[in-house]
Amino acid sequence: VLPAKPENISCIFYYEENFTCTWSPEKEASYTWYKVKRTYSYGYKSDICSTDNSTRGNHASCSFLPPTITNPDNYTIQVEAQNADGIMKSDITYWNLDAIMKIEPPEIFSVKSVLGIKRMLQIKWIRPVLAPHSSTLKYTLRFRTINSAYWMEVNFTKEDIDRDETYNLTELQAFTEYVMTLRCAPAESMFWSGWSQEKVGTTEEEAPYGLDLWRVLKPAMVDGRRPVQLMWKKATGAPVLEKALGYNIWYFPENNTNLTETVNTTNQTHELYLGGKTYWVYVVSYNSLGESPVATLRIPALNEKTFQCIEAMQACLTQDQLVVEWQSSAPEVDTWMVEWFPDVDSEPSSFSWESVSQARNWTIQKDELKPLWCYNISVYPVLRDRVGQPYSTQAYVQEGIPSAGPVTQADSIGVKTVTITWKEIPKSKRNGFIKNYTIFYQAEDGKEFSKTVNSNILQYRLESLTRRTSYSLQVMASTNAGGTNGTKINFKTLSISVL
């Protein structure tokens, strides 16, 4: 059988290294060797690259080496496959070396900010040594913030006569570390160099970008004062490296600015004690270069009716995220504040919050929440400066079996009945939503019986027991992950009824 006709011939000129062609099929059933016929020097010269030695038969590539690589040039290439049965020739293909030239990557030697120029980095590099001197090179600069996985790209060209191998990358974030990598190619070529070694640079620091501001309203105290826990953080989009030296807070009752009070703090939380009226609160952060824009919050009057617009809310888990979605009757509301914190028996140690805009869902990576912990999640609608009634739900990112079973006791023991009572498992030991309880009971040397009840039941009356009989009993609490038995208790039914 004749060899297959060589097809899909693809050639690439590795500048000053070799000119290599590959083709298909890559493997033949029988031993096949190949010849690559070439004309070069604009047709003036011809030669052949052959794989016909025993070690390289069946090898679907061949390389021409210097000094027979001329540039610029047009090459004609034809591949011949030969086996014991005969020869098959490819179609003749034509290659302009400028269009298939691949050069070494450039080397970035500095990525620096330029004094006094904001949000810009100047990249300086060394043009590859192995690149045609007179050629215009095209470049792709890839860049990303140091903690991002997503690259952005910018393309540009440089004439050889420039000899100014620099590029000013603008419209970056202030005071942010960027990773840069660069590749290049002759302007006419379809083949890019590899990417250069990555280099890191940091844009100049500026005054703080801004703050996100929120509050927790606490019940009024006996003396009528209202504790309001203010909290703030760098606004979404603020530079990762940004550090504030401190924060200025000022607040006053609505329409009464002459009662303005001010506070300076270096913390990101502060408790205010306000009267029952409506208050306005303002916070700015500052560093050595200036102040951030003002973050504003309206604290409603104690007796103010808040609007309600969230009708329903669902929390669901994807492979690596917790997704909370809600439905609203108010299309004009497009900002929401999401709060989440662990549902524990004591004061929550961590309280988190985040603003959501132009969406009715919120997602968080599962690994940002602790498994086996129940989280309270509340969503507040925000319409301009008004905050509406929250809607709350609970969620686990991963359920487990309870760490302990219910503590159980037997009450009202009768001749044939007993009332079993058990305590709720402490929140810290539930490890999931308790979906039901199962009571296992067994007479001495007898068969075991069980009864399953809903999670809202903490007491159950067992009937049809045998008089004057010892029983052992335990209650199992179950989550979606499985159940855990509580302590085993023993009781004995009475021999006669005691009124």
Epitope: K37, G43, K45, S46, D47, R56, S63, T68, Q78, I92
Partner: antibody
Framework: EVQLVESGGDLVKPGGSLRLSCVAS????????MSWVRQAPGKGLQWVSG????????GYADAVKGRFTISRDNARNTVYLQMNSLRAEDTAVYYC????????????????????????WGQGTLVTVSS | EVVMIQTPLSLSVSPGEPASISCRAS???????LVWYLQKPGQSPQLLIY???SRATGVSDRFSGSGSGTDFTLRISRVEAEDVGVYYC?????????FGQGTKVEIK
Amino acid sequence: EVQLVESGGDLVKPGGSLRLSCVASGFTFDDYGMSWVRQAPGKGLQWVSGINWAGGTIGYADAVKGRFTISRDNARNTVYLQMNSLRAEDTAVYYCARESPLRLGDLGGDYFYYYYYIDVWGQGTLVTVSS
Amino acid sequence: EVVMIQTPLSLSVSPGEPASISCRASQSVSSRYLVWYLQKPGQSPQLLIYGTSSRATGVSDRFSGSGSGTDFTLRISRVEAEDVGVYYCQQYDNSPRTFGQGTKVEIK
């Protein structure tokens, strides 16, 4: 047996035209380059023109540039030399020659390399340009 | 064009004696593209040496070639009667291809 047979040589007046043909046999014609080389009476060899295996013109001697044209017809195993505006100094025996890929001593590396050289010559055809 | 100068233009050698022909190029030529031919009296030329030093099929090992750049040499270790004729060098490296003017070898 490899053979090159030239024809078309003749006596022609200055300014006239002539077409030389060279029919090849005994080898796969389209794998080879072909050249015309001439030799004026009692003089040395002069390369006139050549055509590569792919059908591309190798070039022309300065003395014939613009007047002579080389071509090949692979289906007929024939190479042609069209000669126009002939001059007395074009009088010569015109040889058809085959350019074959010959392997140079191993250059190292993974592959073998072959370069094309004139290795077979025809017997020649005489062109006389005279009034 | 590249001018190829051969020396001597003629050479008379006794049988069994060595002979040497020089070929000098007006500019550098790749050794891959330097060839020697012999044209025996009344015959077409035949290929002797290609790529400066590789012998063509059937050529006696009495013939050897060497050189690089602009200076190339053809040597015959022991001249025999069948070696008479005109020897030509030719370069393929630059267009147009050019021959030397020829060196006539005869037997004393």
